[in-house]
């Protein structure tokens, strides 16, 4: 397992006690070029200056060449996640050369060892690939170097000593532990391939982060913040808690990375997109919806080479497994007056109506506090394709709902008895797709009736396309 | 053809070790990994652990901890798995199974068993 | 560690017979099973990887299916060298673990 604690080890083992016993460690890798997407099918192994190999399994000097990079092991023995990367390359790339380096001999120790012998593995890579350069028609810039956690610093050093540029360098979680925060050469960074991709599914802001925090390419994208994946919860991956531990948590959210890039190649037809935004925070806002100025990308193996002048964060939404795409929606609505708020925030959920779908009710998260005269912005995500919203149904969740709430108003009740009935007013709600990148305004369905109150819906239709009021000019808006 | 060929019976003691030796033919010796599974008289498969033999990196079940130690000998392409404090539960067929290089991979092919039987 | 439970533990039946043995793991596997065929004496065989994929050598009557936690394994029409014991394994988590066996026996 390529997490500093799998899910053959505890917790408490964390980076210090191997859980394999070492009868002999020589510092030796291999590379085993894939040639079919049957797992058990040998392949063959190519090693530096023999070039037969190379022609009796038919490596195709022009096509594309994967190179897929393994991390940290305490078994010794490959994960289901490389053979099922291996085979969505082959799916997709069907001409391409998909190469495993095995480097298990070196990274089935302490992590700490592991971790110092990622230079030495990198540096096979690179001579590796200055060997291939030496053959008529291979050309670095047809070479994809895909690392996981540890194996994405691996590719980091294989780019940084080759001679020439690699074309590409994925980095799906890239290891955090004696990484976060080093000096840009003794980790993945964006001058380590022409162009650098990352995905962040273990990024902690407290205890251990298994996968590096701060951005290390040209595009960092961290679905879901980053952090807490879906399905990933221990109830999620456990099934039932007698059968596993929170280790089993770890290596969901750490491998989910591998799983989202998996998704991108054989499911082409639902890419998933992230959106530049400064932090997490702003993005679960709504305000990072935007496609104007390369502000957006596709994730994984259809990202769009981006050579931003500095690191580039991007987030996006996703479901708990594959298709992993989701339709994100940035919600302003206009609070232009309430009364008797009290000390609580309102509850609100969404539901949106289509075309092809209607959503489910749908949270509004309120990551600060509702503001009045001024227009407050949502983030909401659909798993499905609604199609061309009609119509929206807001409802304020009424105090019983929630005990949290109940117990609040009860107290509010006994401080001022008589505080008459809460009430916001909304006349409109401007919603974007992220997707489609288009803006839609819906009003109240009775101009009249523009207050809601809780445990009531307020009902709003489609009553123009863009946002324009009198007086607006619509920006040009660029599809993704 | 792949043939995998174990040692004979055992007969311990009590609190005494054993090892078996597996053979393996047929195949790259140092391209799968060995793996020893055990079944008690009428009852079912118990994984016991793995070696790689490419480089001797091992992987035990928690069940056994310190007791088992897989090692093998490249030259000759042998696997072997020692058991130490043994208990008369440890009677047993033990086999050698050989499995490709992922965790899903199968044991496709195993060697025909050593039984070990433990008795005062 | 994920737990294989098989049912039935033992199976009377008739050559001809279409018999089904199913194996159920404690949390989903993802149809990394394995089902293995062993006679008294002797040790195990593959006879299916991958939830339905056939070993090389095994009968076409033989095969696979399932998803998620539970599988089957299926004899379209038994034959009388198909009277033995039968295994599932998981291959997704360390430990490797195994069902408790399922007995075809001669009805």
């Known amino acids: 397992s390529p997490v500093p604690f799998g899910p053959e080890g505890r917790l408490e083992d964390k980076l210090h006690k191997p859980k394999a016993t070492q009868t002999e460690v020589k510092p030796s890798v291999r590379f085993n070029l894939r040639t079919s997407k049957d797992p058990e099918h040998e392949g063959c192994y190519l090693s530096v200056g023999h070039s037969q190999p190379l022609e009796d399994c038919s490596f195709n000097m022009t096509a594309k060449t994967f190179f897929i990079i393994h991390g940290w092991t305490m078994s010794g023995i490959f994960e289901n996640w490389l053979h099922k990367l291996v085979s969505a390359l082959h799916t997709r790339e069907k001409d391409a050369n998909v190469v495993v380096v095995d480097w298990l001999p070196l990274a089935h120790q302490l992590y700490t060892d592991a971790v110092n012998n990622t230079r030495v593995v990198g540096h096979s890579i690179a001579r590796m690939l200055d060997w291939l350069q030496e053959k008529d028609d291979f050309s670095l810039g047809n070479v994809h170097l895909i690392g996981y956690s540890l194996g994405a610093h691996v590719a980091g050093y294989a780019g940084n000593f080759v001679k020439g540029t690699v074309g590409r360098i994925t980095g799906l979680d890239p290891a955090g532990p004696m990484f976060e925060g080093a000096d840009i050469h003794k980790r993945l960074s964006p001058d380590d391939a022409d162009f650098v991709d990352v995905l962040h599914t273990y990024t902690r802001s407290f205890g251990l982060s298994i996968g590096i925090q701060m951005p290390v390419g040209h595009i960092d994208i961290y679905p879901n913040g980053g952090d807490f994946q879906p399905g990933c919860g221990l109830n999620d991956v456990l099934g039932s808690i007698a059968y596993g531990t929170i280790t089993e948590v770890v290596k969901c959210e750490h491998e989910r990375a591998v799983h989202l890039f998996v998704d991108s190649l054989v499911n082409q037809d639902k890419p998933s997109f992230a959106f530049q935004c400064t932090d997490s925070n702003r993005f679960k806002k709504g305000i990072c919806l935007s496609c104007r100025k390369n502000r957006c990308n596709s994730i994984g193996y259809n990202a769009k080479k981006m050579r931003n002048k500095r690191n580039s964060k991007m987030y996006l939404k996703t479901r708990a497994g594959m298709p992993f795409r989701v339709y994100h929606y940035q919600m302003k609505i206009h609070v232009f007056s309430y009364k008797n708020m009290g000390e609580i925030e309102p509850t609100f959920y969404v539901t949106l109506y289509g075309t092809n779908a209607d959503s489910q009710t749908l949270p509004l998260e309120i990551v600060e506090r509702i503001e009045q005269n001024a227009t407050n912005t949502f983030l909401v995500y659909t798993e499905e394709d609604l199609g061309d919203l009609l119509k929206i149904q807001l409802t304020w969740e009424g105090a019983s709902q929630s005990w949290y709430n109940l117990w609040k108003e009860f107290r509010s009740y006994l401080s001022q008895p008589r505080n008459p009935g809460r009430e916001l007013n909304i006349r409109r709600i401007r919603v974007k797709s992220g997707e489609t990148q288009r803006k839609l305004t819906f009003c109240t369905e009775d101009p009249e009736n523009t207050s809601i109150s809780p445990g009531r819906e307020l009902w709003f239709r489609k009553c123009r396309d863009g946002w324009r009021m009198k007086n607006e000019t619509s920006p040009t808006v660029e599809l993704p | 053809q792949v043939q995998l060929v174990q040692s004979g019976a055992e007969v311990k003691k009590p609190g005494a070790s054993v090892k078996v030796s597996c053979k393996a033919s047929g195949y790259t010796f140092t391209d799968n990994t060995i793996h020893w599974v055990r079944q008690a008289p009428g009852q079912g498969l118990e994984w016991m652990g793995h070696?790689?033999?490419?480089?001797?990196?091992?992987n035990n079940n928690e069940k056994f901890k310190d007791r088992v130690t897989m090692t093998r000998d490249t030259s000759i392409s042998t696997a072997y798995m020692e058991l130490s404090r043994l208990r008369s539960d440890d009677t047993a067929v033990y086999y050698c199974?050989?499995?490709?290089?992922?965790?899903?991979?199968?044991?496709?092919?195993w060697g025909q068993g050593t039984t070990v039987t433990v008795s005062s | 560690d994920i737990q294989m439970t098989q049912s039935p533990s033992s199976l009377s039946a008739s050559v001809g017979d279409r018999v089904t043995i199913t194996c159920r793991a404690s949390q989903d596997i993802n149809n990394y099973l394995n089902w293995y065929q062993q006679k008294p004496g002797k040790a195990p065989k593959l006879l299916i990887s991958y939830t339905s994929k056939l070993h090389s050598g095994v009968p076409s009557r033989f095969s696979g299916s399932g998803s998620g936690t539970d599988f089957t394994l299926t004899i379209s029409s038994l034959q009388r060298e198909d009277f033995a014991t039968y295994y599932c394994?998981?291959?997704?988590?360390?430990?490797?673990?195994f069902g408790q066996g399922t007995k075809l026996e001669i009805k």
């Open positions: 199974a050989r499995k490709g290089i992922y965790y899903s991979s199968p044991f496709d092919y």
């Open positions: 070696i790689n033999p490419y480089y001797g990196g091992t």
């Open positions: 394994q998981q291959g997704n988590t360390l430990p490797f673990t």
